[in-house]
């Protein structure tokens, strides 16, 4: 004889008064059973769209819409998609360090400005958050070279660039 | 299926140089970081620093700056790093791991299966 | 700089919840993504967690992972602990969006 809550699977729920288990009403959802009220579906609007539609047994999961990117815990919020010379941390935009560039819109990581000293090359012109440095044409000379060593913002960490 | 072979296990003399290699398979392998990681026996991960195999730009810890050297060859897909004048402190686990591009500050979502480097006289 | 602080050890019974926790020294925890690997002997670590609360194809719902503000934390929290879930776990954060920062590891026992 079922006199508990306890048996109840997910997606019901169950009062103790009387220890029934009852389907989730439509548009409501428990991922424990035996609660007694079932959870009301998140709905995804405005900014947001389903990623993941509810059941009776989940939430619904919320995404951006094109042009926007998540923030937050489940996607509590959208923010715009970063611009060029950016990069997405999960503090929203945040501009490339010191030594890193980023040429996509909207999508992509900082990453090192080429070292242009791997290919015997000089630096023809130096690098931007934006865009990569440009390499000139193999060195051919045997003048001394200098090493600057570029730390990226907020930590450890060189880069090295071969400046002739 | 994304998978990251390193090479083999190496035992080293105090004062030589160890060079592990990491095989990249099935994605982009210039578009995603590599990052480099050892594990000291019975202690904790430590970051000894990446490389973004499209250009070769690389970063590297404090701690492993003029010591390590990261490349990458492109036509394997293999990134290398190299580890000079070893000690016997350099005796560890050597990972070598991917970054995905989604944000500055992420996971790593595949790892090589580590490559045991002993440092001994 | 940043630190992610973890306790060694950590022991449970099976069928219990397991919290593991992770302090940042620095900084607020909401400004950080959280990443959680599990590691067992002899073998690569596996992502259990990312950015804070997700979980990778194939980890079961038992992983689940959240922060606390108040106490400048992430935590990784295993329900229904099973004796295949013994394992070092460890926290990963970033101190730069280049330099990557570990917690120590806390070695799960499961009773």
């Known amino acids: 004889v079922q006199n508990s809550c306890d048996n109840c699977q997910p997606g019901t729920f169950c009062r103790k008064y009387n220890p029934v288990c009852k389907s989730c009403p439509p548009s409501t959802f428990s991922s424990i059973g035996g609660q007694p009220n079932c959870n009301i579906c998140r709905v995804c609007a405005g900014y947001f769209r389903f990623k993941k539609f509810c059941s009776s047994t989940h939430n619904a999961e919320c995404e951006c819409i094109e042009g926007f990117h998540c923030l937050g815990p489940q996607c509590t919020r959208c923010e715009k998609d970063c611009r060029p010379g950016q990069e997405l941390t999960k503090q929203g935009c945040k501009t490339c360090s010191l030594g890193t560039f980023n040429d996509q819109n909207g999508t992509g990581v900082c990453r090192p400005w080429t070292n242009c000293s791997l290919d015997g090359r000089s630096v023809l012109k130096t690098g931007t958050t934006e865009k990569d440095v440009v390499c000139g044409p193999p060195v051919v000379s045997f003048s001394p070279s200098t090493t600057i060593s570029v730390t990226p913002e907020g930590g450890p960490g060189g880069h090295s660039l071969q400046v002739l | 299926e994304v998978q990251l072979v390193q090479s083999g296990a190496e035992v080293k003399k105090p004062g030589s140089s160890v060079k592990v290699s990491c095989k990249a398979s099935?994605?982009?392998?210039?578009?995603?970081?590599i990052y480099w990681v050892r594990q000291a026996p019975g202690q904790g991960l430590e970051w000894i620093g990446n490389?973004?195999?499209?250009?070769?730009?690389?970063f590297y810890g404090e701690k492993f700056m003029g010591r390590a050297t990261f490349t990458a060859d492109t036509s394997t897909s293999t990134a290398y790093m190299e580890l000079s004048s070893l000690r016997s402190e350099d005796t560890a686990v050597y990972y070598c791991?991917?970054?995905?591009?989604?944000?500055?500050?992420?996971?790593?979502?595949?790892w090589g299966q580590g490559t045991l480097v002993t440092v001994s006289s | 700089s940043v630190e992610l602080t973890q306790p060694p050890s950590v022991s449970v019974s099976p069928g219990q919840t397991a919290r593991i926790t992770c302090k940042l020294n620095?900084?607020?925890?909401?400004?950080?993504?959280v990443h959680w690997y599990q590691q067992k002997p002899g073998q690569a670590p596996v992502t259990m967690i990312y950015?804070?609360?997700?979980?990778p194809d194939g980890i079961p719902e038992r992983f689940s992972g959240s922060s606390d503000s108040s106490s400048n934390s992430a935590f990784l929290t295993i329900s229904g602990v099973q004796a295949e879930d013994e394992a070092d776990y460890y926290c990963h954060s970033y101190d730069s969006t280049i330099t990557p920062v570990f917690g120590g590891g806390t070695k799960l026992t499961v009773l």
């Open positions: 490389i973004w195999p499209g250009n070769g730009g690389t």
């Open positions: 099935g994605y982009t392998f210039t578009s995603y970081y």
């Open positions: 950015r804070d609360d997700k979980r």
């Open positions: 791991a991917r970054r995905p591009d989604y944000s500055g500050d992420d996971y790593f979502d595949y």
């Open positions: 620095s900084g607020n925890i909401g400004s950080y993504y």
